[in-house]
Interface confidence: low
Amino acid sequence: HNTTVFQGVAGQSLQVSCPYDSMKHWGRRKAWCRQLGEKGPCQRVVSTHNLWLLSFLRRWNGSTAITDDTLGGTLTITLRNLQPHDAGLYQCQSLHGSEADTLRKVLVEVLADPLDHRDAGDLWFPGESESFEDAHVEHSISRSLLEGEIPFPPTS
């Protein structure tokens, strides 16, 4: 899988979407997990409703929510009040039995809040191509990593 990068602003919400083939994954629950290092396991953060027919109901685990549009084939994860420690590599998964198929690999990047002037000399402001005019909007800027880009570099 290519890795898709979603960038959000610290303190705001970030919405991550994972499209999938609704027929291929019919009847399957979904999950959002965090990759533990280059070779480590993917630790479950939150999963959709135990009853697949109720997958549209938003489920929360702390500040992370998940909801599944099973007809349209889109899994949506919301990270509320994004913090620096939320940055990292995640996966959207489709569950079947004890197995999990990766729907999308996601790299979450957390940008400094441009309205936070506590340490202005150390802030990195998003470029003009990335629009953050409205502080209340859920920002979700995504890009795909190139084949050569590896989110977890080979162990040295």
């Epitope: 965090r34 533990l36 290092g37 280059e38 480590g40 630790q43 913090q83 620096p84 420690h85 939320d86 940055a87 990292g88 590599l89 790299l107 979450v108 990047e109 957390v110 940008l111 400094a112 340490d119 150390d122 990195w124 590896i150 989110p151 977890f152 570099p153 040295s156």
Partner: antibody, heavy 124, light 108 residues
């Protein structure tokens, strides 16, 4: 092999400045978040600062915020810590450390490579 | 800030003993905890990350467990080279990253 080598420590008077350097080799420096951690004589470990792999984000301990600045030069594979307005309580061995996670910065993985440390003594 | 409290602060043990060190977080940190070993005059060495993942090159006699607020580092059979100070560290909520106060493992 993977290595971090700190330099720049020494004896300095209170209120003066010092800049520490940390030269990295054996890994892709520009892909990893980097930390500074210090240890006062006979005491435990205290985290000082972290900088993202690309320098885009920097975070500090309250005890050094506004006085210390972490930076990096990826073209030189070097991490820096600029220490201003030094106080006696800043006396410690300073270690630079590489974050295990890579790519985006320090986030819940731990520090898998450490330098040998450089000693900073603040005394009049 | 998240505080980490290690216990005991020191432990006397013999070669071959099973040694257990605990680390308690002041709030839920899920599994985001690392363990380090430090010998006098040396830099810390990462043993365990993400509460239970053994760092490459670390002997299998070291193991980590726990989640939430209570964590444990276990040395199944203490070896002469294991006499050192051990620190836990959380990296889930920062700044600041925080370390526990340390546990010194001494020869009985």
């Amino acid at each position: 092999q993977v290595q971090l080598v700190e330099s720049g420590g020494g004896v300095v008077q209170p209120g003066r400045s010092l800049r520490l350097s940390c030269a990295a080799s054996g890994f892709t420096f520009s892909s990893y978040g980097m930390h500074w951690v210090r240890q006062a004589p006979g005491k435990g470990l205290e985290w000082v600062a972290v900088i993202w792999y690309d320098g885009s984000n920097k975070y500090y301990a309250d005890s050094v915020k506004g006085r210390f600045t972490i930076s990096r030069d990826n073209s030189k594979n070097t991490l820096y810590l600029q220490m201003n307005s030094l106080r006696a309580e800043d006396t410690a061995v300073y270690y630079c450390a590489k974050d295990l996670g890579g790519y985006y910065g320090g986030a819940a993985y731990g520090m898998d490579v450490w330098g040998q440390g450089t000693t900073v003594t603040v005394s009049s | 800030d998240i505080q980490l409290t290690q216990s005991p602060s020191s432990v006397s043990a013999s070669v071959g003993d099973r040694v257990t060190i605990t680390c308690r977080a002041s709030q839920d940190i899920s599994s985001w905890l690392a363990w380090y070993q430090q010998k006098p005059g040396k830099a810390p060495k990462l043993l365990i990350y993400a509460a239970s993942s053994l760092q490459s090159g670390v002997p299998s006699r070291f193991s980590g467990s726990g989640s939430g607020t209570d964590f444990t580092l276990t040395i199944s059979s203490l070896q002469p080279e294991d006499f050192a100070t051990y620190y836990c560290q959380q990296e889930v909520d920062y700044p600041p990253l925080t370390f526990g106060g340390g546990t010194k493992v001494e020869i009985k």
